[in-house]
């Protein structure tokens, strides 16, 4: 993929078209959050991305142009984690059941759930259509990508004293300059082909000593599987 390090996702690059086939856009008249397709009929996103009506857009690259690979499917069920806490953003995870099955192809496909927790130092891919400016507003039309490492839980907790639960982890750069941002929420953090994280929160975007905070999907695999089974 062409690399442009000036101001994407913040500090990322334009993803190669449809190179993140599990990435979805949640739309309510505008893109407001991302998500990840985990099977033909289910999407994982962030709990704080809850809205009563959501259209899930799959196969997107440029969200402002119909490019021919898109599938727009309304949400049939939107299930936020029962212990989601708006104040702390603990348990910031949500499942969306599509009203019809997605057609799986080269441009729309699923991502695997994790089989082990994220290991410190692992390089991950974060993607989304969120703000590309660390201050101000510059929302891209084309999907942005960022390669970033998993930080140790100690560094994560030191960056956000008293705010990091066991259901959260940090990914990014303590020096700042590269991070997810507003509009990336709910989107994927994929490490070694597994969905390890969901974009959740942070103190600003790309600020020094304030890395991005992500929901630890590994802790919710059982809940995800049970919820899908109970709603199939």
């Amino acid at each position: 993929a062409p690399f442009d390090d000036d101001d994407k996702i913040v500090g990322g690059y334009n993803c190669e078209e449809n190179s993140v086939p599990y990435q979805v856009s949640l739309n309510s008249g505008y893109h407001f959050c991302g998500g990840s397709l985990i099977n033909e009929q289910w999407v994982v996103s962030a709990g704080h991305c809850y809205k009563s009506r959501i259209q899930v857009r799959l196969g997107e690259h440029n969200i402002e142009v119909l490019e021919g690979n898109e599938q727009f499917i309304n949400a049939a069920k939107i299930i936020r984690h029962p212990q989601y806490d708006r104040k702390t953003l603990n348990n910031d995870i949500m499942l969306i059941k599509l009203s019809s099955r997605a057609v799986i192809n080269a441009r729309v496909s699923t991502i695997s759930l994790p089989t082990a927790p994220p290991a410190t130092g692992t390089k991950c891919l974060i993607s989304g259509w969120g703000n590309t400016a660390s201050s101000g507003a510059d929302y891209p039309d084309e999907l942005q990508c960022l390669d970033a490492p998993v930080l140790s839980q100690a560094k994560c907790e030191a960056s956000y004293p008293g705010k990091i639960t066991s259901n959260m982890f940090c990914v990014g750069f303590l020096e700042g300059g590269k991070d997810s941002c507003q509009g990336d929420s709910g989107g994927p953090v994929v490490c070694n082909g597994q969905l390890q994280g969901v974009v959740s929160w942070g103190d600003g975007c790309a600020q020094k000593n304030k890395p991005g905070v992500y929901t630890k999907v590994y802790n919710y695999v059982k809940w995800i599987k049970n919820t899908i089974a109970a709603n199939s």
Partner: antibody, heavy 125, light 107 residues
Framework: QVQLVQSGAEVKKPGASVKVSCKAS????????ISWVRQAPGQGLEWMGW????????NYAQKLQGRVTMTTDTSTSTAYMELRSLRSDDTAVYYC??????????????????WGQGTTVTVSS | DIQMTQSPSSVSASVGDRVTITCRAS??????LAWYQQKPGKAPKLLIY???SLQSGVPSRFSGSGSGTDFTLTISSLQPEDFATYYC?????????FGGGTKVEIK
């Protein structure tokens, strides 16, 4: 259906306080925020402040800082706006309006899709 | 603070006319702009959100466009019920700010 119903008109003396209520129905109160907007006679719209219904986080217009307090009561799905040390130029119609939450790294969009009917506050000696 | 400048402040038009109202932000706000219609003695009503998305129940003769700093509200064929005051609002950052309003009057 989704609606916001505000308390009735008030007449106050300069220096007094007023508290306007806004009762929400037809949606989950804590999934949204409430903004307060006022409109003086013959004038345009002036934003006063914003409150998260779930966390009670607030953001006030600078010119009203120290005089305005916004609160919510989640048990009754009601938002309140109190304005103190009233002056004659506070005479206006006060509106509450529903908007998106500002939370996490969700898209930051703070438009207002549902409005209350308005509460007339007259400040006169 | 982001200043919103609306023009014109008033426009006289006839039923069936195409009416265009512009709104300029003092700094870039991406697509985060809303348009409201207000009739005398009534609360504002949301017409357009996120610059170009039509609010449910609003007639398709209303449309919005723009991104960054320059935005437009267009009424393709003015109807008698459209005579009102229209406001833009930046929905990108606090403090929320409104344009000064455009009054659409009968010619």
């Amino acid at each position: 259906q989704v609606q916001l119903v505000q308390s009735g008109a008030e007449v106050k003396k300069p220096g007094a306080s007023v508290k306007v209520s806004c009762k929400a129905s037809g949606y989950t109160f804590t999934d949204y925020a409430i903004s307060w907007v006022r409109q003086a006679p013959g004038q345009g719209l002036e934003w006063m402040g914003w409150i998260s219904a779930s966390t009670a986080d607030t953001n006030y217009a600078q010119k009203l800082q120290g005089r305005v307090t916004m609160t919510t009561d989640t048990s009754t799905s009601t938002a309140y706006m109190e304005l103190r040390s009233l002056r004659s130029d506070d005479t206006a119609v006060y509106y509450c309006a529903r908007g998106d939450e500002v939370v996490g790294k969700r898209t930051y969009y703070i438009g207002m899709d549902v409005w209350g009917q308005g509460t007339t506050v007259t400040v006169s000696s | 603070d982001i200043q919103m400048t609306q023009s014109p402040s008033s426009v006289s038009a006839s039923v069936g006319d195409r009416v265009t109202i512009t709104c300029r932000a003092s700094q870039g706000i991406s697509r985060w702009l809303a348009w409201y219609q207000q009739k005398p003695g009534k609360a504002p009503k949301l017409l357009i959100y996120a610059a170009s998305s039509l609010q449910s129940g609003v007639p398709s003769r209303f449309s919005g466009s723009g991104s960054g700093t320059d935005f437009t509200l267009t009424i393709s064929s003015l109807q008698p019920e459209d005579f009102a005051t229209y406001y833009c609002q930046q929905a990108n950052s606090f403090p929320i700010t409104f344009g000064g309003g455009t009054k659409v009057e009968i010619k």
